[in-house]
């Protein structure tokens, strides 16, 4: 009696259980009473990641450099290509379909967390006693110069964007 269900890694066709093609291979012809399933390896830039009966392999993802993407890991006959962003850029989504330039922290703000390939720069305002006078994607807030340790006095107060200006102490004549 013809089967109504087949074992794992098999499929039912023409009242017969045929072996599925292994990952990395596509189906050329179904099995018959006398022949095994015929499978063929996927070609260059193609893959299939499951046991299957597909007649065409899937195309590897293209990491478009015009979108700031590059290949992080080449695809194989069984896996898709993994894209990532070029240095200085990060993915706009989990699927990493495009990239945007890392944000810079404006003067008065410092980098709390440096950007990665998947997350943007996190900035924080420079608290009292700290400053940042540049727009940067990696500079933290710097502490004001300590005039006292240099045996100098504060001539101009610091802000979140400028360092203090030190000067010589007034000498008593």
């Amino acid at each position: 009696e013809p089967p109504t269900a087949c074992r794992e890694k098999q499929y039912l066709i023409n009242s017969q259980c045929c072996s599925l093609c292994q990952p990395g291979q596509k189906l050329v012809s179904d099995c018959t009473e006398f022949t095994e399933t015929e499978c063929l390896p996927c070609g260059e830039s193609e893959f299939l990641d499951t046991w299957n009966r597909e007649t065409h392999c899937h195309q590897h993802k293209y990491c478009d450099p015009n979108l700031g993407l590059r290949v992080q890991q080449k695809g194989t006959s069984e896996t898709d290509t993994i894209c990532t962003c070029e240095e200085g850029w990060h993915c706009t989504s989990e699927a990493c379909e495009s990239c945007v330039l890392h944000r810079s922290c404006s003067p008065g703000f410092g980098v709390k967390q440096i950007a990665t390939g998947v997350s943007d720069t996190i900035c924080e305002p420079c608290p009292v006693g700290f400053f940042s006078n540049v727009s940067s994607a990696f500079e933290k807030c710097h502490p004001w110069t300590s005039c006292e340790t240099k045996d100098l006095v504060v001539q101009q107060a610091g802000t979140n964007k400028t360092d203090v200006v030190c000067g010589p102490q007034d000498r008593l004549r």
């Epitope: 260059e44 990491c63 478009d64 450099p65 590059r70 290949v71 080449k74 006959s77 070029e86």
Partner: antibody, heavy 119, light 109 residues
Framework: QSLEESGGRLVTPGGSLTLTCTVS????????MGWVRQGPGKGLEWIGT??????TDYATWAKGRFTISKTSSTTVDLKMTSPTTEDTATYFC???????????????WGQGTLVTVSS | AFELTQTPASVEAGVGGTVTIKCQAS??????LAWYQQKPGQPPKLLIS???TLTSGVPSRFKGSGSGTEFTLTISDLECADAATYYC???????????FGGGTEVVVK
């Protein structure tokens, strides 16, 4: 389509040297480029590759000593710092098969330029 | 560290004969392997990419096969013009998996 390397010369150990690859009929905005070297009587050694975006990757042994950069729409440079006698070789530039990947095969090569490191 | 071992270092065969060159990777590189031919005083010339894809203009006497870690270049019906050094190159994703084999010198008698 052609590639031509220039800048090879006798250099003293510890100095620095920049080689230039000038391309003709090749669009550097759509083709990745690589540098490969070959010591006298030795095999081929991949140095590094530059993608169309300007991103680079290097062989582990080459990191920090070699820098690849795109200097114009028709030139790619290889800068070598602190060379030793082991760096004596013919240096080839070659076109990579992909524009977005550092790990490529090379389908067009220049004739090479000889660098001799000696005191 | 990744290694690409090419054997033999040298092989000799007569005109019309066949030579087989092997290339072994220390880890799987799927099918990302290319073969080059280099003659003295000349740059390498790409023969085969992705294990078995023949470059345009290369005769079908050159045949590449393999996958994973074991690869082979077979040259049949040898001609005098085939005398050269042959290199395999892996180009999988990894700093040191973009490397060349040590080369095989083919001498045609």
């Amino acid at each position: 389509q052609s590639l031509e390397e220039s800048g090879g010369r006798l250099v003293t150990p510890g100095g620095s040297l920049t080689l230039t690859c000038t391309v003709s009929g090749i669009d550097l905005s759509t083709n990745g480029m690589g540098w490969v070297r070959q010591g006298p009587g030795k095999g081929l050694e991949w140095i590094g590759t530059i993608r169309v975006t300007g991103g680079t990757d290097y062989a582990t042994w080459a990191k920090g000593r070699f820098t690849i950069s795109k200097t114009s729409s028709t030139t790619v440079d290889l800068k070598m710092t602190s060379p030793t006698t082991e760096d004596t070789a013919t240096y080839f530039c070659a076109r990579g098969h992909a524009n977005n990947d550092a790990y490529v095969y090379f389908n067009l090569w220049g004739q090479g330029t000889l660098v001799t490191v000696s005191s | 560290a990744f290694e690409l071992t090419q054997t033999p270092a040298s092989v000799e065969a007569g005109v019309g004969g066949t030579v087989t060159i092997k290339c072994q990777a220390s880890q799987s590189i799927d099918r990302y392997l290319a073969w080059y031919q280099q003659k003295p005083g000349q740059p390498p010339k790409l023969l085969i990419s992705y294990t078995s894809t023949l470059t345009s203009g290369v005769p079908s006497r050159f045949k590449g096969s393999g996958s994973g870690t074991e690869f082979t270049l077979t040259i049949s019906d040898l001609e005098c013009a085939d005398a050269a050094t042959y290199y395999c190159q892996s180009y999988f994703t990894s700093d040191d998996a973009n490397t060349f084999g040590g080369g095989t010198e083919v001498v045609v008698k």
